[in-house]
Amino acid sequence: EVEKTACPSGKKAREIDESLIFYKKWELEACVDAALLATQMDRVNAIPFTYEQLDVLKHKLDELYPQGYPESVIQHLGYLFLKMSPEDIRKWNVTSLETLKALLEVNKGHEMSPQVATLIDRFVKGRGQLDKDTLDTLTAFYPGYLCSLSPEELSSVPPSSIWAVRPQDLDTCDPRQLDVLYPKARLAFQNMNGSEYFVKIQSFLGGAPTEDLKALSQQNVSMDLATFMKLRTDAVLPLTVAEVQKLLGPHVEGLKAEERHRPVRDWILRQRQDDLDTLGLGLQG
């Protein structure tokens, strides 16, 4: 906390400009009006304030808005956002996607900080669901965002938002998360034709049940081994050798290279040797 001192004569700030970088901390505290700062927040980022000076500016805003900053101020926080604690952010009510983007831009290129996580949580909870535009924005800044959500949080994602999901957004999702996302993707893409449907659904198949895999095996989809390796063990085990052969098409030869890895190993173990021999790959059940 900066001690309360009177502003020296002639130093009272009439606007937020570069002259303020020469002010000592106590002078900023005494000479910058919080209301002026709030209305001219957009100028702060153009001025090379020190971290100590930014602390003073934050302190002034905190005094002016003890219940939390209004969105008009939040949108223009810029680098001052990095000074905010999760506790500060929990007081905010951020409803504009533009505000969210502005703050995410400040943290761009860095891992998701506790501040950003809190901001996103507040924003999504305020909207009630993870809509397509929000998901588009979040995955653009943080490709792993979707997979950082719990299965319970993912359940609030409407099927329409699934169109915004790119394959790389699902790279770090675990089986429980894909279990939630797959039915939504199936619903979202249900009106697409066979080959187009498979292209879209492919990255969600880690949540697919056996019956859906059996259905896909009848559609000449030629699933690659990387996708097959991500399928649920319980969904793969009941598949027959003939079904796996149809599902993988020309990629079936890749089973040999993966025979010691799950779920291929589990599946091989539970097949009749005579059936495996029909593949001509030398797989041992």
């Epitope: 675990d174 089986p175 991500k230 799950r262």
Partner: antibody, heavy 119, light 107 residues
Framework: QVQLQESGPGLVKPSETLSLTCTVS??????????WSWIRQPPGKGLEWIGY???????NYNPSLKSRVTISVDTSKNQFSLKLSSVTAADTAVYYC???????????WGQGTMVTVSS | DIQMTQSPSSLSASVGDRVTITCRAS??????LNWYQQKPGKAPKLLIY???SLQSGVPSRFSGSGSGTDFTLTISSLQPEDFATYYC?????????FGGGTKVEIK
């Protein structure tokens, strides 16, 4: 519920063969989802997986022990067994049998049996 | 073989503390990672399977996360009965391997 019980000699001489049996009760060794493993733990050390068997007789062994290990299954007795040949003092450990569910992990363990290799 | 490296090898904590144990695989193991708890003189007990799924009957203060090569076991609020040794284990490759263990002791 399924329970496992190890049995066998607690003392084995160097260069001889260690033999242990695991009896499965409350369930079948022929379960579709289960493989049956042996795991050991030397005194004061960590866990080392030895190998598993499926009811069909298919086996999978730890490469570092493969040349000395044989695991077999007797579905009629609801048992599976471990044989470890040419033992040395380094094979002294608590030996556990365990069930691995294909969808989870080693979810059921025996209480373990201490085997000492000494002359 | 896939090497599993656990850290720390031991830690001291108090009842109520949040405890995090990490496990790193020498190559990607997808989500085929299990966590076990072992108390002296007892067999290990399965806590978490498939990296993040809680085994039936295990308290919800235990949670797991991660995929690929980096995994975490978290105990949200340590209880007296949680002082034990914890092991991670990969089952992706046919040659199963365990981490070296993390001993959680009372501070």
């Amino acid at each position: 519920q399924v329970q496992l019980q190890e049995s066998g000699p607690g003392l084995v001489k160097p260069s001889e063969t260690l033999s242990l049996t695991c009896t499965v009760s409350g369930g079948s060794v022929s379960s579709y989802y289960s493989t049956w493993s042996w795991i050991r733990q030397p005194p004061g050390k960590g866990l080392e997986w030895i190998g598993y068997i499926y009811y069909s007789g298919s086996t999978n062994y730890n490469p570092s022990l493969k040349s000395r290990v044989t695991i077999s299954v007797d579905t009629s007795k609801n048992q599976f067994s471990l044989k470890l040949s040419s033992v040395t003092a380094a094979d002294t450990a608590v030996y556990y049998c365990a069930r691995e569910d294909a969808l989870t992990g080693f979810d059921i363990w025996g209480q373990g049996t201490m085997v000492t290799v000494s002359s | 073989d896939i090497q599993m490296t656990q850290s720390p090898s031991s830690l001291s904590a108090s009842v109520g503390d949040r405890v995090t144990i990490t496990c790193r695989a020498s190559q990607s193991i997808s989500s085929y990672l299990n966590w076990y708890q072992q108390k002296p003189g007892k067999a290990p007990k399965l806590l978490i399977y498939a990296a993040s799924s809680l085994q039936s009957g295990v308290p919800s203060r235990f949670s797991g996360s991660g995929s690929g090569t980096d995994f975490t076991l978290t105990i949200s609020s340590l209880q007296p009965e949680d002082f034990a040794t914890y092991y991670c284990q990969q089952s992706y490759d046919a040659s199963y391997t365990f981490g070296g263990g993390t001993k959680v002791e009372i501070k």
